[in-house]
């Protein structure tokens, strides 16, 4: 019998390399049975995860999974960091693994490295 616990499918040590100025959607895949849980995003600040209140969010429904989406319209340099989603289910809090955004702050659109360049310069993601 399939478990009816809420599950959040963010992979351990997942990350996204993105550019400041681009739109980006950070998705939290949520599996639930009867009632969709309340889901929130937080951003890690040291060991504390600070709840992102009042941000642009939405839900997307697919066949067997829902996605709680945090929208970046667009990405800002300050968005660099690690994020976690959590679900409130039967008075319990279920937390996802954290996912990290590596934001490259390109000062001019013409300076943007190509995908090939990015692949050959992984250190750029961490600068």
């Amino acid at each position: 019998k399939e478990s009816c616990d809420v599950q959040l499918y963010i992979k351990r040590q997942s990350y996204h390399s993105i550019f400041a100025g681009d739109p980006f959607k950070l998705e939290c895949p949520v599996k639930y049975c009867a009632h969709r849980p309340q889901v929130t995003w937080c951003k890690l600040n040291g060991t504390t995860c600070v709840k992102l209140e009042g941000r642009h969010t939405s839900w997307k429904q697919e066949k067997n999974l829902s996605f709680f989406i945090l929208h970046f319209e667009p990405v800002l340099p300050s968005d660099n960091g690690s994020y976690r989603c959590s679900a409130n289910f039967l008075s319990a809090i279920i937390e996802s693994h954290s996912t990290t955004l590596y934001v490259t702050d390109v000062k001019s659109a013409s300076e943007r490295p190509s995908k090939d360049e990015m692949a050959s310069r992984p250190w750029l993601l961490y600068s």
Partner: antibody, heavy 117, light 107 residues
Framework: QVQLVQSGAEVKKPGASVKVSCKAS????????IHWVRQAPGQRLEWMGW????????KYNDKFKVRVTITRDTSASTAYMELSSLRSEDTAVYYC??????????WGQGTTVTVSS | DIVMTQSPDSLAVSLGERATINCKAS??????VAWYQQKPGQSPKPLIY???YRYSGVPDRFSGSGSGTDFTLTISSLQAEDVAVYYC?????????FGQGTKLEIK
């Protein structure tokens, strides 16, 4: 404190272009998007587009896409909105606004553009 | 485009009384709605974001509620300085769109 100061009123003939400036102070221009919104007499506010000054990336309302160009000069901490092929219905007050993650938080004082032959 | 429809178009309320302005979106905008106040000859001033979060410095007599397609701005006890036009705005889907405005006056 954060301030957005816009250029002065303009009177233009139909078919001409207008370029409105928005000078930011009290924060780093490249940290937030600048949006442009207009308000024609007796009409609702109308969102035109935004620029992310760090990279120059822009997003436009399709209604204005072929006629509007939003640019920035980071060294002057200034964003610009140019609207071409002006017609009488473009007569409006044009606002720049700084958006944080939520709403348009700080607004310029507005620039009145009058299109008249 | 998402159409934001406010009701009523104008509203007259006595000082100290409650004022309620409604905003209906033509499709689901989740909670991605802001409310602005605009006084004559001035730029819009943000009051509420994400449907119910008050901007710092905004008096707590202003409150917002709603999600999906139906939103409400409430002023719990009208003050003379609240006379203005109020606009809702959705930022869920491009292009961002505003309501037509509700003019609030003192009865």
């Amino acid at each position: 404190q954060v301030q957005l100061v816009q250029s002065g009123a303009e009177v233009k003939k139909p078919g001409a272009s207008v370029k409105v400036s928005c000078k930011a102070s009290g924060y780093t221009l490249t940290d937030y998007t600048i949006h442009w919104v207009r308000q024609a007499p007796g009409q609702r506010l109308e969102w035109m587009g935004w620029i992310y000054p760090g990279s120059g990336n822009t997003k436009y309302n399709d209604k204005f896409k072929v006629r509007v160009t939003i640019t920035r000069d980071t060294s002057a901490s200034t964003a610009y909105m140019e609207l071409s092929s002006l017609r009488s219905e473009d007569t409006a007050v044009y606002y720049c606004a700084r958006r944080n993650y939520y709403a348009m938080e700080y607004w310029g004082q507005g620039t009145t553009v009058t299109v008249s032959s | 485009d998402i159409v934001m429809t406010q009701s009523p178009d104008s509203l007259a309320v006595s000082l100290g009384e409650r004022a309620t302005i409604n905003c209906k979106a033509s499709q689901n905008v989740f909670t991605n709605v802001a409310w602005y106040q605009q006084k004559p000859g001035q730029s819009p001033k943000p009051l509420i974001y994400s449907a119910s979060y008050r901007y710092s410095g905004v008096p707590d007599r202003f409150s917002g509620s709603g999600s999906g397609t139906d939103f409400t701005l409430t002023i719990s006890s009208l003050q003379a300085e609240d006379v203005a036009v109020y606009y809702c705005q959705q930022y869920s889907t491009y292009p961002y769109t505003f309501g037509q405005g509700t003019k609030l006056e003192i009865k």
